[in-house]
C-alpha cells in the first residue's frame, strides 16, 4: 500500500518555499497540475494550477505562487514567495485527470513559517520579495471546478487563461481570495 508521507520545511517570513514534484513524463506531461492546501477536516483547496494543456516551462503565477511545468524533466516546480506566517500548513501537488480522481504526487509538504529571519550577515534572505514581481505577460490559469465523479453536475470548463498584471496579487492570508476547488474525497 502507498503510504502518505510528509516532508517538513521550516522557513522564515519573507523567504521562499521552492519544491519540485516528480511525475511520469509519458503519462502526465501535458496534464493540468495544481498546488493545493489541505486544512484539517476540510477538502483540499486548489491555490494555483497550470493551464490546460499544461505548457512547457511556462510560468503561471497566482499571487505569491509560481508554477513551472518542465515537461522534458517530468517536474512541476512550485514556488511560494514572500512567505507569511499564515501560509503555514500542509500542501500537495496533484495532477488533474478527469473523469478520474486527481493523481497526488509525493510528498506532501508540511510548511512551517515563523516570524523574523535567521540570516548570515550579507545574505539576501528577503530578496525574493523583489525578485519575483509578477511579469505582465505571465498567464494565470483558471482551475477547473471539479466535483466528485460520483456526483458530477457539470463538466470541467474548457481551458481559460487571462493576463495577470502586477497589481493582481492574491493574498493567501485572505481565504476569500483563494481559488476554491472542491476535489474528490
Amino acid at each position: 500500500a502507498t503510504k502518505l508521507t510528509e516532508e517538513k520545511y521550516e522557513l522564515k517570513e519573507g523567504q521562499t518555499l521552492d519544491v519540485k514534484c516528480d511525475y511520469t513524463l509519458e503519462k502526465f506531461a501535458s496534464s493540468q497540475k495544481a498546488w493545493q492546501i489541505i486544512r484539517d477536516g476540510e477538502m483540499p483547496k486548489t491555490l494555483a494550477c497550470t493551464e490546460r494543456p499544461s505548457k512547457n516551462s511556462h510560468p503561471v503565477q497566482v499571487g505569491r505562487i509560481i508554477l513551472e511545468d518542465y515537461h522534458d524533466h517530468g517536474l512541476l516546480r512550485v514556488r511560494m514567495v514572500n512567505l507569511q506566517v499564515e501560509d503555514s500548513g500542509l500542501y500537495q501537488c496533484v495532477i488533474y485527470q478527469p473523469p478520474k480522481e486527481p493523481h497526488m504526487l509525493f510528498d506532501r509538504i508540511r510548511l512551517v513559517v515563523t516570524k523574523g529571519f535567521s540570516g548570515t550577515p550579507g545574505s539576501n534572505e528577503n530578496s525574493t520579495q523583489n525578485v519575483y514581481k509578477i511579469p505582465p505577460t505571465t498567464t494565470k490559469a483558471l482551475c477547473p471546478l471539479y466535483t466528485s465523479p460520483r456526483t458530477v453536475t457539470q463538466a470541467p470548463p474548457k481551458s481559460t487563461a487571462d493576463v495577470s498584471t502586477p497589481d493582481s496579487e492574491i493574498n493567501l492570508t485572505n481565504v476569500t481570495d483563494i481559488i476554491r476547488v472542491p476535489v474528490f474525497n
Epitope: K20, D22, F106
Partner: antibody, heavy 119, light 108 residues
Framework: EVQLLESGGGLVQPGGSLRLSCAAS????????MSWVRQAPGKGLEWVST????????YYADSVKGRFTISRDNSKNTLDLQMNSLRAEDTAVYYC????????????WGQGTLVTVSS | EIVMTQSPATLSVSPGERATLSCRAS??????LAWYQQKPGQAPRLLIY???TRATGIPDRFSGSGSGTEFTLTISSLQSEDFAVYYC??????????FGQGTKVEIK
C-alpha cells in the same frame, strides 16, 4: 525504516565493465527518484546519476555520460548502474541514495560499494 | 553548472565550542541547499535541507542559515560525535546538483 543495500563492486581493468545494484526497502520505491553518488579515496562527494521515480527521466554527470547507464526495476525495488569503458578515475565508493520527495537532495544513503579500476 | 565553495577546508575546534562552517554558491540558489555529515568509513547523513530545516533525528545544536549565495552551518556546542567532514549541496533545479568540496571539523 528505509534501507538501501548496494552490491556489485570489485576490481576491474581499465576499459572493463561492471554493474552495480541497490536493493531498496522501507518506502514506496516507485514514488521517488534515486541516485548514485561516488567518492574517490580521500576525496569529496561527486554526484553521478539520477533517475526519476517512473524511470522516464535520467540525468548523468558529464564525467560519466555515454559510459554509464542508470536504470530501475520498480517491480523488484532495485536500482542499477551499468558502468562501461571504466577508467582509473572511476575508482571510488559508489553510494546508492534516495532522493527526497520534494527536491533533489538525498535523505537516505546506502553503505556504499567500492569499485577499483586498475590493471 | 553551479560551483559550491566551502570554507575553511579544515576547522579545529575544542569540544563544547561553537563551529561555524560556510558554503558559497556561484549563483543564487535561494534556499535550495542541503548539509551532510560524513564520518570516516561511513555513508553521508543528511543534516539540513532547504537551508534551515533539520532532517529527522538531527539534534538542535545543528542549525542552518543563509539564502541566495551565502550559507552557514552552525554547531552550537561540539560533541565528540560531531567531529567529521561536512558537505553542502545545491538543488536549485534538476541535476546536476553539485556538492562543495567539504569542511573537516577536527579536535583542537
Amino acid at each position: 525504516e528505509v534501507q538501501l543495500l548496494e552490491s556489485g563492486g570489485g576490481l576491474v581493468q581499465p576499459g572493463g565493465s561492471l554493474r552495480l545494484s541497490c536493493a531498496a526497502s522501507g518506502f514506496t520505491f516507485n514514488a521517488y527518484a534515486m541516485s548514485w553518488v561516488r567518492q574517490a579515496p580521500g576525496k569529496g562527494l561527486e554526484w553521478v546519476s539520477t533517475i526519476s521515480g517512473s524511470g522516464s527521466t535520467t540525468y548523468y554527470a558529464d564525467s560519466v555520460k555515454g559510459r554509464f547507464t542508470i536504470s530501475r526495476d520498480n517491480s523488484k525495488n532495485t536500482l542499477d548502474l551499468q558502468m562501461n569503458s571504466l577508467r582509473a578515475e572511476d575508482t571510488a565508493v559508489y553510494y546508492c541514495a534516495k532522493v527526497a520527495g520534494s527536491n533533489f537532495f538525498f535523505d537516505h544513503w546506502g553503505q556504499g560499494t567500492l569499485v577499483t579500476v586498475s590493471s | 553548472e553551479i560551483v559550491m565553495t566551502q570554507s575553511p577546508a579544515t576547522l579545529s575546534v575544542s569540544p563544547g565550542e561553537r563551529a561555524t562552517l560556510s558554503c558559497r554558491a556561484s549563483q543564487s540558489i535561494n534556499a535550495n541547499l542541503a548539509w551532510y555529515q560524513q564520518k570516516p568509513g561511513q555513508a553521508p547523513r543528511l543534516l539540513i535541507y532547504g537551508a534551515y530545516t533539520r532532517a529527522t533525528g538531527i539534534p538542535d545544536r545543528f542549525s542552518g542559515s543563509g539564502s541566495g549565495t551565502e550559507f552557514t552551518l552552525t554547531i552550537s556546542s561540539l560533541q565528540s560525535e560531531d567531529f567529521a567532514v561536512y558537505y553542502c549541496q545545491e538543488f536549485i533545479l534538476f541535476p546536476p546538483n553539485t556538492f562543495g568540496q567539504g569542511t573537516k571539523v577536527e579536535i583542537k
